[in-house]
């Protein structure tokens, strides 16, 4: 079997409320029943985990309660949303997909989505 391919958009602009959404799609080489999806942030050569979720095929994606990520899954496609972003969080966000069960394990890593975050301008003081 060949390696697993993961596709994600090259660029996404976060909303004024600091929310960014993108689709992570993977070409599954096997018949996985358990999949783990991780969002990684790459800054310089440092790679850190933003959030991770494991789901059973056909079930919903559940991130931890305190996670800044939410998501939904449909077949080999995961819709990811990252919240609470600020300008300093602008960077490359990599989608990592792991087919956990049954063996063999497969790893797939996307090329990353550059997320641009612009902090909203503070509202000017008003006399009214």
């Amino acid at each position: 079997c060949k390696a697993m391919h993961v596709a994600q958009p090259a660029v996404v602009l976060a909303s004024s409320r600091g929310i960014a959404s993108f689709v992570c799609e993977y070409a599954s080489p096997g018949k996985a029943t358990e999949v783990r999806v991780t969002v990684l942030r790459q800054a310089d050569s440092q790679v850190t985990e933003v959030c991770a979720a494991t789901y059973m095929m056909g079930n919903e994606l559940t991130f931890l309660d305190d996670s800044i990520c939410t998501g939904t899954s449909s077949g080999n496609q995961v819709n990811l949303t990252i919240q609470g972003l600020r300008a300093m969080d602008t960077g490359l966000y990599i989608c990592k997909v792991e087919l956990m069960y049954p063996p063999p394990y497969y790893l797939g890593i996307g090329n990353g989505t550059q997320i641009y975050v612009i902090d909203p301008e503070p509202c000017p003081d008003s006399d009214f």
Epitope: A3, R36, L40, K96, P103, L107, I109
Partner: antibody, heavy 105, light 98 residues
Framework: PGRSLRLSCAAS????????IHWVRQAPGKGLEWVAV????????DYADSVKGRFTISRDNSKKTLYLQMNSLRAEDTAVYYC???????????WGQGTLVTVSS | TLSLSPGERATLSCRAS??????LAWYQQKPGQAPRLLIY???SRATGIPDRFSGSGSGTDFTLTISRLEPEDFAVYYC?????????FGPGTKVDIK
């Protein structure tokens, strides 16, 4: 031969439960051989054919410790056994110093 | 085994039996020591690795290049695919002093 042994590997300095951990071995004067891997919460594991059914990998995330239970040991299991952490992007970025296991009659 | 002199260029090859995309790493091992990660993703240098080390290739054919050998570079080098289990290592290439 035929005896059992349990190896352990204590980790520190990182979020243990966020990483898969491998056992890799090296027979004297030979190359590296992958033995087993355990992922995240410990439910998912995989083994090399050469140890399947004889070795069991496990982890205790609360103690940040990895284990390898080796049963029915054979002379060919003689090797230095390394534990190694899986980096976020997949390779093995940190390795233990290794433990020599000798199986002799 | 590659027998070379300090200052020379070393080119090491690794061939996978089937495509591993770019999920390939290179490790350096010196006698009595644990392996050390040099290259991951076929071409990305690990933290703290000097830029004389470079990797290239994708699919089934990969290369590790050491542009100018330093005395501390004489060691054994292993490639490993990590895109699927089993996570196989190559047989290793020893780079020794000519």
């Amino acid at each position: 031969p035929g005896r059992s042994l349990r190896l352990s590997c204590a980790a520190s300095g990182f979020t243990f439960s966020s990483h898969g951990i491998h056992w890799v071995r090296q027979a004297p004067g030979k190359g590296l051989e992958w033995v087993a891997v355990i992922w995240y919460d410990g439910r998912n594991k995989d083994y090399a054919d050469s140890v399947k059914g004889r070795f069991t990998i496990s982890r205790d995330n609360s103690k940040k410790t990895l284990y390898l239970q080796m049963n029915s040991l054979r002379a060919e299991d003689t090797a230095v056994y390394y534990c190694a952490r899986v980096a976020p992007l997949g390779p093995l970025d940190y390795w233990g110093q290794g433990t020599l296991v000798t199986v002799s009659s | 085994t590659l027998s070379l002199s300090p200052g020379e260029r070393a080119t090491l090859s690794c061939r996978a039996s089937q495509s591993v995309s770019s999920y390939l790493a290179w490790y350096q091992q010196k006698p009595g020591q644990a392996p050390r990660l040099l290259i991951y993703g076929a071409s990305s240098r690990a933290t703290g690795i000097p830029d004389r080390f470079s990797g290239s290739g994708s699919g089934t054919d990969f290369t590790l290049t050491i542009s100018r050998l330093e005395p501390e570079d004489f060691a054994v080098y292993y490639c490993q695919q990590y895109g699927r289990s089993p996570f196989t290592f190559g047989p290793g290439t020893k780079v020794d002093i000519k």
